[in-house]
């Protein structure tokens, strides 16, 4: 979990300040008004690891 | 820390009733959908009932088997989550436990309570 | 509804050596990024933990040992080395719709 200002969120995650932690963009897809989701339209998906 | 304390549960006769309650504490409750699932020998985990949130108007959502007789219902005031069971029958037994997810995986699980439904 | 069926319904695994556990659903649970797949231990007299998220990510504090990968219709959970400590039952579980279903679990026992 990252603070607001430091470190950015790992990939496949954005900081969301309602739960005050990193949150997963896969979660968009159920909850796409949550307050990480913009943050997740620019970062990449974590890859799937195949 | 995460803490889902669960109380409820016991002995109670086919079409009787029972309510199970859920305290949540260590986390933003409000945000979070909450949810029950049982587990039996025969039908192993099985998601029953989800309630949202408030600003969606609390939405459920059912399993088809506990679908007219279960109601789940929350107070975000009290940061609990209810599960009201009517007309309970036999192949209702089971370890029932109160889940928390935000939209995909149940990250916490309260410590399980047991109801028997039996004459 | 979409069903998971998961293989083995147990498995005996010596110390130190690979339990690999499989989950198959009846449809496609991806997107062209994600899987919504997710994987729980659960020892006995206490509720599932949660391990993995969309298919291949660790929660955090669980070991790296603990590695999960597929797409589509196909996971696979892999642990490795085993240890004493993995002796439970694994469970998948789905959240593409509702309902959220689970597999039936996969025992590991330690020879």
């Known amino acids: 979990e990252q603070a607001p200002g430091t470190a950015p969120c790992s990939r496949g995650s954005s900081w969301s300040a309602d739960l005050d932690k990193c949150a997963d963009c896969a979660s968009c897809r159920a909850r796409p008004h949550s307050d990480f989701c913009l943050g997740c339209a620019a970062a990449p998906p974590a890859p799937f690891r195949l | 820390e995460v803490k889902l304390q669960q109380s409820g549960g016991g002995l109670v006769q086919p079409g009787g009733s029972m309510k199970l309650s859920c305290v949540a504490s260590g986390f933003t409750f409000s945000y979070y959908w909450m949810n029950w699932v049982r587990q039996s020998p025969e039908q192993g985990l099985e998601w029953i009932a989800e309630i949202r949130l408030q600003s969606n108007d609390y939405p459920t959502h059912y399993a088809e088997s506990v679908k007219g007789r279960f109601t789940i219902s929350r107070d975000d005031s009290k940061n609990s989550v209810y599960l009201q069971m009517n007309n309970l029958r036999p192949e209702d037994t089971g370890i029932y436990y109160c889940?928390?997810?935000?939209?995909?995986?149940?990250?916490?699980w309260g410590q399980g309570t047991t109801l028997t439904v039996s004459s | 509804d979409t069903v998971l069926t998961q293989s083995p319904a147990s498995l005996v695994v010596s110390l130190g050596q690979r339990a690999t556990i499989s989950c198959r659903a009846s449809?496609?649970?991806?997107?062209?990024?994600?899987?919504?797949i997710h994987w729980y231990q659960q020892k006995p007299g206490q509720p599932p933990k949660f391990l993995i998220k969309?298919?291949?990510n660790r929660d955090s504090g669980v070991p790296a040992r603990f590695s999960g990968s597929g797409s589509g219709t196909d996971f696979t959970l892999n642990i490795h080395p085993v240890e004493e400590d993995d002796t439970a039952i694994y469970y998948c579980?789905?959240?593409?719709?509702?309902?959220?279903?689970f597999g039936a679990g996969t025992k590991l026992e330690l020879q």
């Open positions: 579980q789905h959240s593409w719709e509702i309902p959220p279903t």
């Open positions: 449809q496609s649970v991806s997107t062209s990024d994600y899987s919504y």
């Open positions: 969309y298919a291949s």
């Open positions: 889940a928390c997810r935000y939209a995909d995986y149940f990250d916490h």
